[in-house]
């Protein structure tokens, strides 16, 4: 019967008892940056093709004995996951493999580094199609070898990479740190994240999916037909490796950007226990498990939006927090969220020809994260109206004011402390969906956008009991863009979008009387692309 | 139900060529490997390569190397293994059988061809 | 290679009455990451295909009869027919399937006394 990893990322219509997916991401070569490998496995015999790459650094210990199958262990499992003709996820994919850890699966940054050249040189001579670099592998945080990873990214080849196996925050390693790489958790058959001995997967807004990582069916370098499982975040990212090569053999045009938000599209929502994860960082990890998509074409005509959380500001006065998109990724929103409710709100603002999302702490706040929308809209005209305090009764108001253009996000950011404790709510009036509202001692930031058949609509859910958190979501066919509390609202510790549902934060309800002052209101701007539609029905 | 089926019994003179078969059924012939194995009369069990039909990877045990031929049509789920020029020694049945991966034993076999070679 | 050798190569046991077979092979087939024995034990019948009895060295295929049962471990390993019935006269092969080539035993013959 199909092995259990198998079978969780293969969309119902595929489901059998043998693992039969549409497409084996033929037109696709992985390089993978391991261990060596034993390359005469007959699971991966004639897949994978060994380089003559090797940066390693000497065993430790002097009674360390070299016993081959012990060195080839992790490689050969991995290059097994990806594209294994029985276990393989990507069963039509090549694979080269490069040796830049040791038999004690130990390697060094400039060993790591000198490897990523080594494709990027490859590349450049002799250009193939779509790339695939597989990093299983995870050491303390490196500038340089982030820089690196964002370099051959921004070339055109994806990179996957593991979480790390710490039990800890992803953003304190690399390369699973570098923004640029498809960063890896692991979960199990019960979709709950992994626990390795005392440790487990890392966790927190570095990781952009988590994979099936335990008891996961290999290649065993013990034997030629051996196999073995193992776990890890690193089996984790050979899932992602083998569904992204997958996704590029059926779409090889498809940009990084493209293909990490399909990843995260097609992902399955919402099934992991999120207790699991340490509580502070339960809001930051996403809560998704990688998936094959149902169909590896026609997905073009979709709006795709994903949310990045920004690193946390600190808890000084003047402390910003900064969430930035891809390149190729449109900013559509901005919003922001405090633990202790102690912010200054946020603004939509250029950095280097390129909109970013910036969260403003408050005195005596703990911190603030900025949270990003960043979606995919081709051709795309967006800018930012901003409309200073208003120091009306009636608060503060922006639209979009140009022809053809559509609001896809509302921000506000006030300089006052503790904006809104002690102020009636302000209604918005209705009727008046292109527009933002807020406080009348807040600036409001209104993202406008125009792009080919770009429609929005702003859809809202107030609860006029005190809650801790209200949700509004967007219905089949509309993705969310902009998520944001009604302003008036108070004690709100921020909004963020969680797929394709507005979430907004209230404090604790037994720390705020029933009072008309606890009613909180979340508001979602939801938008399609009929453009994007019409041209996917056109292709089919 | 899960069988092999495979080709008629062949008598052939030396230096004839000679493609016998093996079909799959009631089981999804691309994911499972088909051997060969050969069995001269009154011997045992020897056995002459693999195939995977999925992507049609070969693996020949030395002693067959070059001295026999084995391909796969998945479209019709059938698994070859021929001759190029026959010899009174390759006299023998010949049956295909089929294993998985992980689970490399041969759990079904086919009913055997025999080839028998004379001038 | 790895060199599967049988004994006896022939065997005589009254009905009802244990019939033990040997299997030792030139290298160890079981390897410690999963902690698996590489071996596998076939009926032939007369004018038969093999068929599959024992796998993992003491695994018995769905279908087989108890009284078959495979043991041993690392190279030497053994086919136990506990209460010896007609229809098991054969010849039996043990195969280790965790190297290429492939190899066979030399087949042992079991008859009726």
């Known amino acids: 019967s199909i092995p259990w990893n198998l079978e969780r990322i293969t969309p119902p219509r595929y489901r059998a008892d043998e693992y039969q997916p549409p497409d084996g991401g033929s037109l696709v070569e992985v390089y993978l940056l391991d261990t060596s490998i034993q390359s005469d496995h007959r699971e991966i015999e004639g897949r994978v093709m060994v380089t003559d790459f090797e940066n390693v650094p000497e065993e430790d210990g002097t009674r360390f004995h070299r016993q081959a199958s012990k060195c080839d262990s992790h490689g050969t499992h991995l290059a097994g996951v990806v594209s294994g003709r029985d276990a393989g996820v990507a069963k039509g994919a090549s694979m080269r493999s490069l040796r830049v850890l040791n038999c004690q699966g130990k390697g060094t940054v400039s060993g790591t580094l000198i490897g990523l050249e080594f494709i990027r040189k490859s590349q450049l001579v002799q250009p193939v199609g779509p790339l695939v670099v597989l990093l299983p592998l995870a050491g303390g945080y490196s500038r340089v070898l982030n820089a690196a990873c964002q370099r051959l990214a921004r070339a055109g080849v994806v990179l996957v990479t593991a979480a790390g196996n710490f039990r800890d925050d992803a953003c304190l390693y690399s390369p699973a740190s570098a923004p640029e790489v498809i960063t890896v958790g692991a979960t199990n058959a019960q979709d709950q994240p992994v626990t390795l001995g005392t440790l487990g997967t890392n966790f927190g807004r570095c990781v952009d999916l988590f994979a099936p990582g335990e008891d996961i069916i290999g290649a065993s370098s013990d034997c030629s037909t051996c196999f073995v499982s193992q776990s890890g975040t690193s089996q984790a990212a050979a899932h992602v490796a083998g569904i992204a090569a997958m996704m590029l053999s059926a779409e090889p045009e498809l940009t990084l950007a493209e293909l990490r938000q399909r990843l995260i599209h097609f992902s399955a929502k919402d099934v992991i226990n999120e207790a699991w994860f340490p509580e502070d960082q339960r809001v930051l990890t996403p809560n998704l498990v990688a998936a094959l998509p149902p169909s590896t074409h026609g997905a073009g005509w979709q709006l795709f939006c994903r949310t990045v959380w920004s690193a946390h500001s600190g808890p000084t006065r003047m402390a910003t927090a900064v969430a930035r998109c891809a390149p190729d990724e449109e900013l559509l929103s901005c919003s922001s969220f405090s633990r202790s409710g102690k912010r200054r709100g946020e603004r939509m603002e250029a950095q280097g020809g390129k909109l970013v999302c910036r969260a403003h702490n408050a005195f005596g706040g703990e911190g603030v994260y900025a949270i990003a929308r960043c979606c995919l809209l081709p051709q795309a005209n967006c800018s930012v109206h901003t409309a200073p305090p208003a120091e009306a009764s009636m608060g503060t108001r922006v639209h979009c004011h140009q022809q053809g253009h559509v609001l896809t996000g509302c921000s506000s950011h006030w300089e006052v402390e503790d904006l809104g404790t002690h102020k009636p709510p302000v209604l918005r009036p209705r009727g008046q969906p292109n527009q933002c509202v807020g406080h009348r001692e807040a600036s409001i930031h209104a993202s406008c956008c125009h792009a080919p058949g770009l429609e929005c609509k702003v859809k809202e859910h107030g609860i006029p009991a005190p809650q801790e958190q209200v949700t509004v979501a967007c219905e089949e066919g509309w993705t969310l863009t902009g998520c944001s509390a009604l302003p008036g609202t108070s004690h709100v510790l921020g909004a963020y979008a969680v797929d394709n549902t507005c979430v907004v934060r209230s404090r604790d309800v037994s720390t705020t009387g029933s009072t008309s002052e606890g009613a909180v209101t979340a508001v979602a701007i939801c938008c399609r692309s009929r453009h994007l539609a019409q041209a996917s029905q056109e292709l089919q | 139900q899960v069988q092999l089926v495979q080709s008629g019994a062949e008598v052939k003179k030396p230096g004839e060529s000679l493609k016998i078969s093996c079909k799959g059924s009631?089981?999804?012939?691309?994911?499972?490997?088909i051997s060969w194995v050969r069995q001269m009369p009154g011997k045992g069990l020897e056995w002459m390569g693999l195939?995977?039909?999925?992507?049609?990877?070969?693996r020949y045990s030395p002693r067959f190397q070059g001295q026999v031929t084995i391909s796969a049509d998945k479209s019709i789920s059938t698994a070859y293994l021929q001759w190029s020029s026959l010899k009174a020694s390759d006299t023998a049945m010949y049956y295909c059988?089929?294993?998985?991966?992980?689970?490399?034993?041969?759990?079904?076999w086919g009913q055997g061809t025999l080839v028998t070679v004379s001038s | 290679d790895i060199v599967m050798t049988q004994s006896p190569d022939s065997l005589a046991v009254s009905l009802g009455e244990r019939a033990t077979i040997n299997c030792r092979s030139s290298q160890s087939v079981l390897y410690s990451s999963n902690n698996k024995n590489y071996l596998a034990w076939y009926q032939q019948k007369p004018g038969q295909p093999p068929k599959l009895l024992i796998y993992?060295?003491?695994t018995r295929e769905s279908g087989v009869p108890d009284r078959f049962s495979g043991s041993g471990s690392g190279t030497d390993f053994t086919l136990t027919i506990s209460s010896l019935q007609a229809e098991d006269v054969a010849v039996y092969y043990c195969?280790?399937?965790?190297?290429?080539?492939?190899?066979f035993g030399q087949g042992t013959k079991v008859e009726i006394k």
């Open positions: 195939i995977y039909p999925g992507d049609s990877y070969t």
């Open positions: 993992w060295a003491s």
């Open positions: 009631g089981y999804s012939f691309t994911n499972y490997y």
């Open positions: 059988a089929r294993d998985h991966g992980y689970k490399p034993y041969s759990d079904i």
């Open positions: 195969q280790q399937y965790s190297s290429f080539p492939i190899t």
